[in-house]
Interface confidence: medium
């Protein structure tokens, strides 16, 4: 029955840890009497047996999924309008393979497996985008910011992680970028600044690094953007699908982020933008469900230098960790975790 | 509720060509296909061709085949007749009517639009 | 394409009558038929699909029966809206309708 259709690409190719949206509709004609019966859609992997093995995505409320796959996978499209249309995020290398979708309306019951939509997951090589609006100039303050705008709102948030030898701290933090407040010295000058992110949701890692230009001479205002590469559209679908991003205010002074440190002599002072819950009868809040940071530090720091920082997101809890770099934790001191929440 | 709203009548000369159109106002025709029927003054219903909007796939009777094109607008949920080489003997009027089933059974209909041709 | 026949052409009945018309088809046509209920001026209405299945709000007066080439549609006891004419459609094979058969009050 020439009725008996499904339109969709050949293939897709995403990047690894990015995102994708596959348009596709079908159209198999149903009984009448089943005309107000639900519609129900689902993408198998290829070889699946319907009765026995789980969807990647399905709009049936009661149907279990394939765990790899689970709130990765998306049928985005409504069946109910002939739309099959597949959501992907967070791709990763296991989701290479063909794909077939299966409609079900009452007692019609079809598996388009003559048309197959094909997925190629490649290698990440897009990279993060730094931004330094103006002139640094020594013992300036400036706005850092690194960016990664082809990533898309719908996948798990990425993590920021900045490494400068240069005195630092945090600024705001999006879902596609992260500011780095730098206040240069001019022996920073030529030093290495790097952006580092990474997609948790398939653990992969890009980066930039670039190196600190600190002149005297005051000169013209310019912005200095250093672009990621590989941002050829050879037949790659890139990401940023519609949909809603978390956006969170971090400010953190590394030089008084709250931190507790056990030692036999002293604790270290305690200062955070945002709120803070150590519960102090208790220690720090600790739950299976947050994860924690350490703070690797030694007792007091008399300087913000030398420090590396990461920013993680989530969907409620937000993480700062400093790596003081050259410095050993005292032989007595153990460390305690703290959270940072943001209001 | 979903209503097929056609277009206006129409006079046509001879040798001419007419296009009507068919709107789903108040829903889609995603899932159906949409045909088009003619019926002759004092005659009977005679079935013209059809479109199934989401596949763009149109087919039409052996007796319309070259003269009819039937397309549609998935955006605006719009179909279109149109009829070329226009006789006397294609005054009729024109309906379109939903199809609502794996038989074709036309379950919502519009009101008809009258094509009058003549010199 | 499959032709269908209607009969009567046109029928006379009075009010509370039982009335019932024919279609036959030029071939087999399992249970793909319908019929419509059309009044001058208006479109056709749809009231019975596959054969003998009533569209919701058709009232139960009207009853369809038949698979194969034979097929009738029986209105047990007609009110006066019920004088219309009435097509069969088959859609085995492309689309026909019948000739019509003309309901008039006696």
């Known amino acids: 029955d020439p009725r008996v259709r499904l339109e969709v690409q050949e293939s897709v190719t995403v990047q690894e840890g990015l995102c994708v949206l596959v348009p596709c509709t079908f159209f198999h004609p149903v009984p009448y009497h089943t005309r107000n019966s639900p519609v129900h859609g689902y993408w198998f992997r290829e070889g699946a047996i319907v009765s026995l093995d789980s969807p990647v995505a399905t709009n049936k409320l009661d149907q279990e999924v394939r765990e790899e796959t689970q709130g990765r996978f998306r049928l985005l499209g409504d069946p109910s309008r002939n739309n099959c249309s597949l959501s992907i995020v967070d791709a990763r290398r296991r989701d290479n393979g063909s794909y077939f979708f299966r409609m079900e309306k009452g007692s019609t019951k079809y598996s388009y497996k003559s048309t197959q939509l094909s997925v190629h997951v490649t290698d990440l090589t897009h990279r993060p985008q730094i931004l330094i609006p103006g002139a640094l100039d020594p013992d300036h303050s400036k706005n850092l910011t690194c960016s990664v705008p082809w990533a898309c709102e719908q996948g798990t948030p990425p993590i920021f992680s900045w490494m400068s030898a240069a005195p630092t701290s945090l600024g705001l933090r999006t879902t596609h970028s992260s500011v780095l407040i730098i206040t240069p010295r001019p022996q920073d000058h030529g030093t290495n600044l790097t952006c580092q992110v990474k997609f948790p949701g398939a653990g992969v890692t890009t980066e930039r690094t670039i190196q600190l230009n600190v002149s005297y001479a005051s000169q013209n205002p310019r912005t200095d953007i250093f672009l990621g590469d590989g941002s050829g559209k050879q037949g790659v679908v890139q990401g940023a699908i519609g949909g809603a991003g978390v956006t969170v205010l971090l400010a953190l002074c590394l030089c008084l982020i709250f931190f507790t440190v056990k030692t036999h002599r002293r604790k270290a002072a305690r200062t955070a933008v945002g709120r803070i819950d150590t519960h102090p009868a208790t220690g720090p809040t600790s739950s299976k469900h947050q994860k924690k940071s350490k703070l690797h530090g030694a007792t007091e720091t008399s300087g913000c230098s030398g420090t590396t920082l990461t920013v993680e997101m989530d969907e409620e809890l937000h993480y700062a960790s400093l790596n003081f770099h050259g410095m050993n934790p005292s032989e007595d001191t153990s460390t305690e975790y703290s959270e940072v929440r943001t209001q | 509720q979903v209503e097929l709203v056609q277009s206006g009548a129409e006079v046509k000369k001879p040798g001419s060509s007419v296009k009507v159109s068919c709107k789903a106002s108040g829903g889609t025709f995603s899932s159906y296909a949409i045909s088009w029927v003619r019926q002759a003054p004092g005659q009977g219903l005679e079935w013209m061709g059809r479109?199934?909007?989401?596949?763009?796939?149109?087919n039409y009777a052996q007796k319309f085949q070259g003269r009819v094109t039937i397309t549609a607008d998935k955006s605006t949920y719009t179909a279109y007749m149109e009829l070329s080489s226009l006789r006397s003997e294609d005054t009729a009027v024109y309906y379109c009517?939903?199809?609502?089933?794996?038989?074709?059974?036309?379950?919502?209909w519009g009101r008809g639009t009258l094509v009058t041709v003549s010199s | 394409d499959i032709q269908l026949t209607q009969s009567p052409s046109s029928l006379s009945a009075s009010v509370g009558d039982r009335v019932t018309i024919t279609c036959r088809a030029s071939?087999?046509?399992?249970?793909?038929l319908a019929w419509y209920q059309q009044k001058p001026g208006k479109a056709p209405k749809f009231m019975i699909y596959d054969a003998s299945s009533l569209e919701s709000g058709v009232p139960s007066r009207f009853s369809g029966s038949g698979s194969g080439t034979d097929f009738t549609l029986t209105i047990s006891s007609l009110q006066p809206e019920d004088f219309a004419t009435y097509y069969c459609q088959q859609f085995n094979s492309s689309i026909t309708f019948g000739q019509g058969t003309k309901l008039e009050i006696k």
């Open positions: 009517a939903r199809e609502g089933g794996v038989d074709w059974y036309f379950d919502l």
């Open positions: 479109i199934i909007p989401i596949l763009d796939m149109a």
């Open positions: 071939q087999g046509i399992s249970s793909a």
